[in-house]
Every structure is written in C-alpha cells, then in structure tokens.
Interface confidence: low
C-alpha cells in the first residue's frame, strides 16, 4: 500500500510565507519518505523536497491564493499526495498615524497595497470593552469619543477569504472639551474667585489660565476647577482665558471678562442750601478716570424712599436736589465701573439741608395789655423749634419756641408778655433744624396802651373868684401809653369817680340841666401851659370859667356861690 | 426644523410584543442619543434607557432590563424600542427624546431638548 | 440613592412668585434639568444647567441649586404657566438618568 498524505494544515501564515504539516498514513515509516512539495500560485508556482513532513515556505506573495500539494516520495514510487488551497494574509499596514483630533473624532489614515479591507479596534484607556469599525478606504474618521480621553486604534488588514494581516496600533487622546460655565464667584479690589465647569469631568486635566488686562498679561495654571487670583488692579478689566490639556493636548480655550471691584469713595465734602446737597469725594484708584458713582440719598427714618443718582464717568461731585428743608440726610456713595460694578463698601456721610426760614409773620397788639401776639405759618421742611427774639434799645431777651409742621397750612401764634406798654420792638425769629439756624426773619413791633395810672394827687384851687377858679393839677404818669390831652371836669354831683361817659358833656348839657358833669377845658400834651420853673414843668394851671373854648369845649363861668368839684 | 416622529397608537394583550418606532430629522441622527421615557395615565416620567445612534451601545433602566431592546437604522434615521412579555402595568405614553452633547458619563446635566409626542400603548386582555 | 423628590402640588396667585424645588443626592454632582408638561402634550424643556433657558422660553423662569436641593423659579407666575414640572439628572453613577416625580402648579 502506498503511503498517504492528509490532513495538510498552514500554520504560522504570514503574507509572505507559511509553515506546512501534514499527517502520513504510515506514520512509522514517515521519515524514510522525502515529500515533494508542489506550490502553485495565481501566476507562478515552485517546488520544494524536504525530508520530514513539516516545511517552511518562504517567497509568497500577500493576498494571494495557492494551491499547495504534498506528494510523499519513496525511491521512484509517489504515494497518495495530499492537497491544502490556502490565501495569504495581507501585509501589514504602513504609515499608520492621526491625521486630525478634536474633542469626540480622531482621524487615522494609513497605507496598505494588497488589503481587501481593514478592522478598527478602538479600545478607550481603561475600559475593557472595545467597538470594531470595518472601512475599505485608507483612511476612517472615528466619531462619538469622549474628549480629553486616551484612545488605542488596532487595524488589522482582512485579505481574500477572512485571512487577516498582522495589526498595527496608534494611540492618541481626544482633545479636551472646552469648559464652560466660568463664574466668578466673589471679586474685591484686587482678588478674583472663579470656578468653571469641565464636561469631560477629567481629573488629570490642567487648566491653564490666561490673564490679561491692559497692564499686561499673567499665566497660571490649576488642577482644580477654581482659582483665586491675587494681586490684581482695582477697577480694571480681566480678561481670562481658561484652557484644558492632558498629557499635552490643548482643548479650545473659553473666556470670561470681569471687572475688579473699585476701591471705596473717601473724603466725602457736602454743602447745603434749604432744598439742595453738593457732594463731592475722592477716588484714588488709577482707573478712577472710567469710574462713575452710584448715590443713594435716603432721608433719616426712610429708607423706602431713597434717591438714586448716577453720574458720569470720572465725575466726582454731584447736587442733589428736591431735598427737604431742615431734614437729615444720609447719602452712600458707590463707585462703579464697567457693567454695574461697584465697590464692596460705599462711603458714607451724614448731612443735614438748611432749615427753611419764616416768610414772615405777623404782629397783633392786645388791648390794654402790655403784650404782644405773633402770628406765622411755618416754613416748608422740618424744623426743631425757633429762637425768638425781642428788643428795645439796651433791652433784649431771647426764648425757644416749640416746633411745628407745614403740612396742613396751619397758622401758630405765641405771646410775648412783660413788655412795655406804647413800645416798639425788635423781633427776630430764627427757624432752628438739625443744629443749624436759618436767616433770621425780622419785624418791629409796637405794644399798645391802657388807662394811664391814676396821679399821686388831686388837683388844687390855686385861686377863687365869684365866677371862676384855677385849677392845679400835675401830669398824668405815661408810663400806660403817651398822654394826648387833659380833660377837666367839674361837677355839682356827689362826690364819687367819673366814668369815661362824662366826657361827652358839655357846659351847654350843665345849663341845660342834662348833667351835672361836664367838661370845661380841654388840654393837649403839647399845648400845655409853661410855668416859668423847671420844677413845674409837667405842671398844668386851667383857669376855669374864662369862658375861652378849647376843641369845640366851652369854658363857661362858674354860678357865684355854686359848689363845685374839680377832677382831671 | 428638528423634530422627533413618532409611531402611532398600539394595543395589545398581555404576553405580547410591542415596537414603537422614532424617526428623526432636521439634525444628524448619528451624533446624539435617543432615550426612552415612559408615563403611566395619571402618573410621573419614567426613564427607560438610551441608545448611542453611533455605535449601537445601549444602557437600560434596571426596571425593563431583559425586556427591552433599543436599536437603530441609520440609514432611515429611526431608532426603535421594542419591549416583550407586556403587563397591564406597562399600558403609558412611550416618549423618545433627544439628548443634546455632551453625553459623556462624567457630564453635569442631562437635557432632553426634542421630545416625541408620545406613543400610547395599552396592555388589556 | 438614585431618587429626586419633588412636592406633589404648589400654588400660587397669579403675578406672584414662587419656588419648585427637587432635591436627591445625585444634584450635589449634577445639575438638574426641569420640563413643562401640560395635559395630553409631550413635556419641554424649560432650565438646563446652571441656570440656561432654551429659546422661545420666558425670562421670568429661572433656575438655582445649593447641596443636594435644584429649584425652578417662576417670577410673576402667569395663567398659561400651569401645568406639571418635572426636575431630572443623571443618577449618582453617571450613567442612567432619573426624574422627580412631578410638581403639579396650580396659578390662583
């Protein structure tokens, strides 16, 4: 029986070469066999004798199907020849690289010359499972990656019937996200917090931050997802660009802008009229030029009802007007730069606007009084009260009047009391507010009369003849009021005191016999008689009964005999 | 413009099978995730799973796991939840809706920006 | 836990303020998302993020979180603002997603 060859197998395929075994029928005397190997090609065939039933066959092409026949030799008789038809793999792929990366692709290209197709394996650092992608062009763009992670690609060449080259592996990492979401979580004068988020959620990341202003640029770069910046200018704009990278790739930066806060407002200066506040303060900043200040004006016990004024950029005085007289103000300054920036702190000053002075007021005499009433309506605004004051040559006194409200149109009066009587006053009256007073407002004032007081003496009969008299009498004290005449009254009534009435009668009404009363001589202050002495000089001699007239009073003779009494 | 289209209304008996389908358009359907949200009549939102329209890969709520199977075709732009051995208690409106990027697992939110209007399925013998 | 607890109904009169909130372990790693539903309609988008509104989305809803607690704020509430809100996140895993179970706001 002839020796049989079977079960040819290939191993090791390579693309240019296989290793041949096969099995013999007669197993014992395998080795006394040579094997004539035969291999035929799609254009070209060889042959090849070895001596054990194991060959190496070099020289083949890749991608290429061959029939391969093993015919086992013994002296000039051929055995049974055993057959294995076989595809070479293709050759490895050249020139495999990234030819473009961003947060969730990377492209790969490569080379190849015999591969029917190629095989991706993407496997994701750290991961166990990989996802296969199958291309028949020289070049893949593998999409849905995560950013920032590391990613291995295997391409194994897939050649004529399922036969696969050896692989190749390139790794490379996604580019980072960009972050997102930056904050700036507090910011003072001169430090920033910022915070960002990372989609990516990548420990290992590097954040490289650059900060710029137009003093210069500053780099710093961070592990975290925060950063403190320090040192920086009050009121001047950062720009701060944030930019991933791990293990050297850069993801796309993203930005935030942001103001320093400015420093606070000092020396804050106010001037004052009834209805209006001029402020103004200073600013040491180096960006004060672009400042503008925020005011807020709020009336001591309203702070609901507060003024806002905002001024121009690198202003630092302002008016503010529509204040009410005589009231207590505070204002806050803020400065303020960019977007509504502010500083953390406003300055702050206390003030109070001018209290309002009186228009005017009025002055009423009381009758028989030595007093007089002042009538005022009180000025607009707020007032503690007024000091009033009154004077007359050498004299003066001064008292504090309560104070009143100018809503409701009120009229408020006082009486000054204890004065003199037929006097003329100054009166000054100064509104008082928040310790400051206002102008004065002035007015004189006379106080008005009442019944002189009675004489120390009644007045003497100088001399009697049978007709007439002459009647002594001393003036009157002035003291109640200016005494304007005299009047001299005789009577034949009983004795008692006259009243006022009595003044309307004449010598006629005595005849007549309508009075017993009358009045005979009537004397003006100045029309009295001079007696020659200084001593006498307020001393008045009325010779009554000269039948003389005096303003429209007849001094008619006197009855011989009659009994008379004589007042003045 | 970007919309999400939805399969009509199914009824079917307990035991049965049911395949709701999605098509997208106005966007490319390969870059983004499609979830599955059900509501019981009268009841909340509840989240089914997703599929990457890339790559196939998929992620279940532990509730429907073994049930459910989410696929996609590409080519039409539709992604499909089908869901097996239905109860009384899976009678709801099924939504599909789209998640915009990131997707990644580390991400700090999850947005549904485009919803379908819904599928009723009813579960009745 | 890979819960979100939501309050079950809210009112409000209308023109005023008010405040849903959610709250779950998993909001103190991610932000909460919050959807408009009204009867018989698909829900919307309303608050993603931080405190982004999608466009066409009124400026007077806005969004807010602190630790474990996302709020949605309506200020000035209107009539057509009623409806259910549902807060969701991914769950403390990262990779599954969870819903609150729906505040239902009722506009006075």
């Known amino acids: 029986n002839a020796i049989q060859v079977f079960d040819v197998t290939a191993v090791n395929i390579s693309a240019t070469s296989l290793t041949l075994i096969w099995k013999v029928s007669d197993n014992e005397s395998s080795s006394n066999y040579t094997y004539k190997i035969h291999v035929a090609g799609e254009t070209d065939s060889s042959n090849l004798n070895v001596s054990e039933p194991r060959a190496v066959i070099p020289g083949l092409r890749s991608s290429t199907f061959y029939n391969i026949t093993v015919c086992p030799v013994l002296g000039d008789i051929e055995g049974t020849p055993g057959f294995l038809q076989v595809h070479t793999p293709p050759v490895p792929v050249s020139d495999f690289r990234v030819t473009v990366v961003s947060t969730t692709e990377i492209g790969l290209a490569w080379s190849s010359h015999d591969a029917e197709s190629f095989q991706m394996h993407i496997t994701q650092e750290g991961a166990g499972n990989s996802r296969v992608e199958i291309t028949t062009n020289q070049s893949i763009i593998i999409g849905g990656l995560f950013p920032g992670t590391k990613y291995c690609f295997e391409i194994v060449p897939k050649g004529p019937n399922g036969t696969e080259g050896a692989s190749r592996t390139v790794c490379n990492r996604t580019v980072p996200s960009a972050v997102f979401d930056i904050h700036v979580v507090y910011v003072t004068t001169t430090e920033m917090w910022l915070d960002w988020k990372s989609p990516d959620g990548a420990s290992e990341y590097v954040y490289h931050l650059v900060i710029e202003s137009k003093h210069g640029s500053n780099h710093t770069s961070t592990y975290d997802k925060a950063i403190t910046l320090q040192g920086l200018i009050p009121g001047t704009l950062y720009n701060i660009t944030i930019s991933p990278e791990v293990d050297h790739v850069w993801g796309d930066p993203n930005s935030t802008a942001q103001y320093t806060r400015p420093s606070n407002v000092s020396n804050i200066d106010v001037s004052t009229n009834t209805t209006a506040a001029t402020l103004s303060w200073q600013n040491f900043d180096d960006a004060s030029p672009t400042y503008s200040y925020c005011l807020l004006i709020e009336k001591a016990g309203n702070s609901s009802n507060a003024t806002q004024v905002v001024t121009d950029i690198g202003i630092t005085d302002a008016t503010v007007t529509e204040l009410i007289p005589g009231s207590s103000y505070t204002v806050e300054i803020f400065a303020q730069v960019g977007d509504g920036i502010k500083s953390l702190e406003p300055g702050r000053k206390s003030f109070c606007t001018d209290p309002a002075s009186m228009a005017s007021f009025d002055c009423e005499v009381v009758p028989k009084e030595p007093a007089l009433v002042l009538k005022w309506t009180c000025p607009p605004g707020a007032n503690a009260g007024f000091e009033l004051e009154v004077s007359s040559g050498a004299w003066n006194n001064a008292t504090h009047l309560e104070s009143c409200s100018s809503e409701n149109g009120t009229e408020y009066r006082t009486e000054v009391t204890y004065l003199n009587f037929s006097t003329s006053y100054n009166i000054s009256i100064t509104t008082v507010s928040c310790g400051k007073m206002a102008a004065p407002t002035r007015n004189t004032c006379t106080t008005g009369i009442t019944d002189p007081p009675p004489p120390d003496g009644s007045p003497n009969i100088t001399s009697v003849s049978h007709n007439s008299v002459k009647v002594k009498f001393s003036g009157f004290e002035a003291s109640h009021g200016p005494i304007k005449a005299y009047a001299v009254i005789l009577t034949t009534g009983e004795a008692g005191h006259p009243s006022a009435d009595v003044l309307k009668y004449t010598y006629e009404d005595f005849k007549k016999g309508a009075s017993d009363t009358y009045v005979t001589y009537l004397i003006r202050t100045e029309e009295k008689g001079r007696s020659q002495s200084l001593s006498e000089v307020l001393k008045y001699e009325i010779d009554v009964g000269n039948e003389s007239t005096t303003l429209g009073y007849y001094n008619g003779k006197l009855e011989p005999l009659g009994s008379y009494r004589a007042c003045v | 413009q970007v919309q999400l289209v939805q399969s009509g209304a199914e009824v079917k008996k307990p035991g049965a099978s049911v395949k709701v389908s999605c098509k997208a358009s106005g966007y490319t359907f390969t870059g983004q995730y499609i979830h599955w949200v059900r509501q019981a009549p009268g009841q909340g939102l509840e989240w089914m799973g997703w599929?990457?329209?890339?790559?196939?890969?998929?992620d279940y709520a532990q509730k429907v796991q073994g049930r459910v199977t989410m696929t996609t075709d590409t080519s039409t732009s539709t992604a499909y939840m089908e869901l097996r051995s239905l109860r009384s208690d899976d009678t709801a409106v099924y939504y599909c809706?789209?998640?915009?990027?990131?997707?990644?697992?580390?991400?700090?939110?999850?947005?549904?920006?485009?919803w379908g209007r819904g599928t009723l399925v009813t579960v009745s013998s | 836990s890979s819960e979100l607890t939501q309050d079950p109904a809210v009112s409000v009169a209308l023109g005023q303020t008010v405040r849903i909130t959610c709250q779950g372990d998993?909001?103190?790693?991610?932000?909460a998302s919050w959807y408009q539903q009204k009867p018989g309609q698909a829900p919307v988008l309303v608050i993603y993020g931080k405190n982004n509104r999608p466009s066409g989305i009124p400026d007077r809803f806005s969004g807010s979180s602190s630790g474990n607690t996302a709020s949605l704020t309506i200020t000035g509430a209107q009539a057509e603002d009623e409806a259910d809100y549902y807060c969701?996140?991914?769950?403390?895993?990262?990779?599954?997603?969870?819903f609150g179970g729906g505040t239902k706001l009722t506009v006075l």
């Open positions: 998993s909001l103190r790693s991610y932000y």
């Open positions: 809706a789209r998640e915009v990027w990131p997707v990644a697992a580390a991400d700090t939110f999850s947005v549904f920006d485009i």
């Open positions: 599929i990457s329209a890339y790559n196939g890969y998929t």
């Open positions: 969701n996140s991914r769950d403390s895993s990262g990779n599954h997603v969870v």
